[in-house]
Interface confidence: low
């Protein structure tokens, strides 16, 4: 609450955070020309990347191209993409859609269809749908530990959000735990209004705000986080401005002295920890 | 402006970027002693990395140390690290500058300098000038798409930078178009009156302002993003302070049962985004 | 000092870090059943990754689970974990503590312990102490040099933590050099009051605090930075929250065809460097 | 490992014909995209002909377009090249080269296994 007489100060604020949790991931696979079903253990290495303290993301889907090599290939043939002769193919032009640089020449694609030929990673990347359900969907029973360190330094004053009372073997509930710092991922879609499932297909962000109203007068002490959650990423957004929350990177390696990548396109939840409150003294 | 009668609160936000671009890199490559010009092409998973969403980072620049392994070698001759006698070299001796921990010999490096022989990944580090003009200068082409959702938690107001009606295929122009959130890198540049071509060689840090000015109350709301661009290194600093913006990493493999490592020196501009601001009501 | 007449404005902070430093790491290393001592070099690129500005992390130990491959096989005997029937093993549970998914069966982990089967990444973790001492414990002689670029935009404000004056081979000391921002590892936990070789076992969090107490009043004009240095996670907590900081990530490879893993638990230091002040104007 | 092994190659008149074969061994054939590539004394290998893995699509370099023809015959793990009104500049060591990520052969990059090579020689 507003104490008018106080000197109010914003908080310093250090976070780290510990996802937990395993996913059995069941696709298909393609080698040699015959598919058949792959099952994979995902943990923490495999879905986490080792981010900053108030940030985490957690891989709930995926897209792989395997073994593109740096080459001259068709594109791919998408919307608006396809040619028919090498008049509609531009030496040098780069489409920002495209994944190559275009050589000039139209080349067969498959059959039936003919796109520009680029110099690129190939066989350039299939932009097909990301897998529907999601492929570690099951990450929405993973958890997280979230330790705030909070700091006044005009005040003089620092505190945390765990303390030695705390049970480490709790989950935050916003009734029956609500200092508990241990969160279930499907938990905090919840409290946000969400679907874990829906918005694991294409990713997305989402925000767990502490706040910190702090009374640092000795004589009516309270220093408590508060949690809440909303998502931050627009989930209307129109198809140009990119929905969702996915980025690629790439598992590069030599065969047969060759050069060569696996390109992954990553869907996942980017969860973003926003510390604010005050803390006030007469 | 400012409004004496509102109640002011500091911006919450959440920042999400998106980079656009293809760089077709030409250099000479050497494999068995002979010399050719290598073509290659660098799409987003090879320029750029998985960071946070307040920072990006494009690669404008490299220097590869390829197929080092650990071993004794003689440490590169820059200014100052040759020796003629074993009594130049300190066994066990670690020079900030070198890559190594000397042996205390001091071993030939080519026909005519001999350096101290070291314990370090071999061969070492050669202390080459970045290529100038830089090998993905193209990059000044590239277009980042950036997303920001802000919060002034006290006034339970959310929005963001992206409105439905704009339009996905824009490009941000501080006369013509200062509301569209994509900015093509080399407009960045040139807005802060910086070179890119010039910058993209030693790489740089370039900040990106968003600020928000909002009048929240109804009969005069207001709530846009002005955006603002400076940079944020020092161009004239003193070489002993590391100008510039670069750092190391290392792709790991197994060759013959050897571990061996490729050492990337990647030059390049990191974009900070720096949001700020606030939010008024009566 | 409060200045009542002034307008104080909070602080936009930009932060450029670099770490330097060669650490020999000496371990005991398996191979064909033959255990010998190793010798290794770490450099940045071995111990530190590209991470943030305000941020930036030192491995100081780690764990090694080499050649994990996706198959079956028996958890790690941990506390509880031992089984001496299938019934004591439930099909499809995923223990939060165990690396895998029960397949339901109970099998010989060596020749007197038997524990639940599962699917995971073989052979699983050994859940083993971190090594004492730690292994890059010379991490404590690594100096980081840190560029800091502040803004007030409300009174069109810029300056920096280095100034031309500065000399590039100073070393911070709070009497001595208080201005220099090269900063020795274990001095920044001296002035903290902690034990850099014990918290490089589990690793840890430091904060560097940069204060800025900005007058910007062109009569009385003084803005120059303020370090002091404090821990930030907590050195008495409760095992189950998971005390000092490590993460664990994988180098994955293809060994005969077969996706394999090494798995490292990287303990080590992070250190966030936490920008804050006012400037002040009438 | 696969094995590629060339035949068919020859002295012949500029303006005759040569049929060159690539057996493959070792590998599925199918899951191979093919191509034929050359190197005349003291030139750089070139890329002459490429074909997909299902032998549907295939490029050819413009300096054989309309003479050469390339196909393949998954049953029998073999690829052919046609060649027709052939001239003294065609004159070099012949290989047959594969790759298990293109889905066609469109130039000398990102090939894999390699044959040992065939003479060809058109005399004026």
């Known amino acids: 609450s507003d104490k008018l007489y106080q000197r109010k100060e914003p908080v310093i604020s250090s976070v780290h955070t510990k996802v937990k949790g395993i996913a059995e991931v069941t696709e298909n696979v393609t080698e040699g020309g015959v598919t058949k079903l792959g099952h994979s253990i995902f943990d923490t290495a495999d879905y986490t990347f080792p981010l900053q303290g108030n940030s985490f993301f957690v891989m709930t889907n995926y897209v792989k191209s395997e073994g593109q090599v740096q080459t001259l290939c068709p594109e791919y043939p998408r919307r608006g993409a396809q040619c028919s002769s090498d008049r509609r193919c531009k030496k040098g032009w780069m489409d920002p859609q495209s994944k190559g640089i275009q050589t000039g020449r139209c080349v067969p694609y498959d059959k039936t269809r003919k796109t520009c030929e680029v110099s690129a990673w190939c066989p350039t990347e299939e932009e097909k749908e990301a897998p529907r359900p999601a492929l570690l969907r099951s990450a929405e029973n993973f958890t997280v530990l979230i330790k705030n360190n909070i700091h006044f330094p005009g005040h003089n004053y620092t505190t945390r959000n765990i303390l030695p009372t705390m049970n480490g073997s709790c989950t935050f509930h916003k009734t029956w735990d609500p200092q508990c710092s241990i969160f279930r991922l499907g938990d905090i879609f919840q409290e946000a209004g969400e679907n874990f499932t829906e918005v694991a297909v294409q990713g997305g962000i989402m925000g767990i705000e502490i706040y910190w109203d702090c009374n640092l007068d000795s004589w009516s002490h309270h220093c408590r986080p508060r949690y809440s959650f909303r998502r931050l990423d627009d989930k209307n957004m129109d198809e140009s401005f990119v929905p969702g929350y996915n980025f690629r990177y790439a598992k590069y390696y030599k065969e047969n002295n060759v050069e060569k990548r696996t390109l992954i396109k990553a869907f996942g939840i980017r969860f973003d920890i926003l510390v604010f409150g005050t803390g006030g003294k007469f | 402006s400012d409004k004496l009668y509102q109640r002011k609160e500091p911006v919450i936000s959440s920042v999400h970027t998106k980079v656009k671009g293809i760089a077709e890199v030409t250099e000479n490559v050497t494999e068995g002693g002979v010399t050719k010009l290598g073509h290659s092409i660098f799409d987003t998973a090879d320029y750029t990395f998985p960071l946070q969403g307040n920072s990006f980072f494009v690669m404008t620049n490299y220097v590869k140390s390829e197929g080092q392994v650990q071993t004794l070698c003689p440490e590169y001759p820059r200014r100052g690290a040759q020796c003629s006698s074993d009594r130049r070299c300190k066994k066990g001796w670690m020079d900030p500058q070198s890559k190594g921990i000397q042996t205390g010999r001091c071993v030939p490096y080519d026909k005519t300098r001999k350096t101290c022989e070291v314990s370090a990944w071999c061969p070492t580090e050669e202390e080459k000038e970045a290529p100038r003009p830089a090998l993905l200068r193209s990059a000044e082409n590239f277009t980042v798409l950036i997303k920001n959702n802000i919060h002034f938690p006290g006034h339970n107001y959310t929005t963001r930078n992206i409105l439905p009606t704009m339009n996905g295929s824009c490009t941000f122009h501080k006369t013509w178009d200062p509301q569209c959130s994509i900015f093509r890198l080399g407009d960045i540049f040139q807005e802060a009156g910086e070179n890119f071509t010039e910058v993209a060689v030693q790489g740089g840090i370039m900040g990106i302002e968003i600020y928000w000015d909002c009048n929240l109350d109804s009969w005069s709301h207001h709530c846009r993003p002005r955006y603002s661009f400076r940079r944020l290194d020092d161009k004239n600093m003193d070489e002993s302070f590391v100008p510039g913006y670069n750092f190391r990493y290392a792709k790991y493999y197994k060759e013959n049962n050897v571990e061996k490592r490729t050492l990337i020196k990647a030059f390049g501009i990191r974009f900070d985004i720096l949001v700020f601001g606030t939010g008024g009501k009566f | 000092s409060d200045k009542l007449y002034q307008r104080k404005e909070p602080v936009i902070s930009s932060v450029h870090t670099k770490v330097k430093g060669i650490a020999e790491v000496t371990e005991n290393v398996t191979e064909g059943g033959v255990t010998k001592l190793g010798h290794s070099i770490f450099d940045t690129a071995d111990y530190t990754f590209p991470l943030q500005g305000n941020s930036f992390f030192v491995m100081t130990n780690y764990v090694k689970s080499e050649g994990q491959v996706q198959t079956l096989c028996p958890e790690y005997p941990r506390r509880g974990a031992q089984c001496s029937s299938d019934r004591r093993c439930k099909k499809g549970w995923m223990d939060p503590q165990s690396k895998g998914i029960q397949t339901g069966r109970c099998v010989p982990y060596d020749k007197t312990r038997k524990t639940c089967e599962v699917s995971a990444w073989c052979p699983t973790e050994e859940e083993k102490e971190a090594p004492r001492p730690a292994l890059l414990r010379s991490a404590e002689n690594f100096t980081v040099l840190i560029k800091n670029n502040i803004h007030f935009p409300g009174h069109n404000y810029t300056t920096r933590n280095i100034l031309p004056t500065m000399n590039g081979s100073c070393t911070f000391h709070k009497t001595w050099d208080p201005q220099c921002s090269i900063f020795r590892l274990g001095d920044i936990f001296q002035e903290a009051g902690e034990n850099f070789t014990e918290v490089a076992v589990q690793g840890g969090i430091m904060g560097i605090e940069i204060y800025w107490d900005c007058n910007l009043d062109s009569w009385s004009h003084h803005c120059r930075p303020r370090y002091s240095f404090r821990r930030l996670d907590d050195k008495n907590m409760d095992e189950s929250f998971v005390p000092g900081y490590n993460f664990r990530y994988a180098k994955y490879y293809k060994e005969n065809n077969v996706e394999k893993r090494t798995l490292i638990k990287a303990f080590g230091i992070r250190f966030d460097i936490l920008v804050f002040g006012t400037g002040g104007k009438f | 490992e696969v094995q590629l092994v060339e035949s068919g190659g020859g002295l012949v008149q500029a303006g005759g014909s040569l049929r060159l074969s690539c057996a493959a061994s070792?590998?599925?054939?199918?899951?191979?995209?093919m191509g034929w590539l050359r190197q005349a004394p003291g030139k750089e290998r070139e890329f002459v002909s490429g074909?997909?893995?299902?032998?549907?699509?295939?490029y050819y370099a413009d300096s054989v377009k309309g003479r050469f023809t390339i196909s393949r015959d998954n049953a029998k793990n073999t690829m052919y090249l046609q060649m027709n009104s052939l001239k003294p500049e065609d004159t070099a060591v012949y290989y047959c080269?594969?790759?298990?990520?293109?889905?066609?052969?469109?130039?000398?990059?990102?090939?894999?296994?390699w044959g040992q090579g065939t003479q060809v020689t058109v005399s004026s």
């Open positions: 080269a594969g790759s298990p990520v293109l889905s066609i052969v469109l130039d000398t990059r990102g090939l894999e296994y």
């Open positions: 070792g590998r599925t054939f199918s899951s191979l995209a």
């Open positions: 074909i997909s893995r299902g032998g549907t699509s295939t």
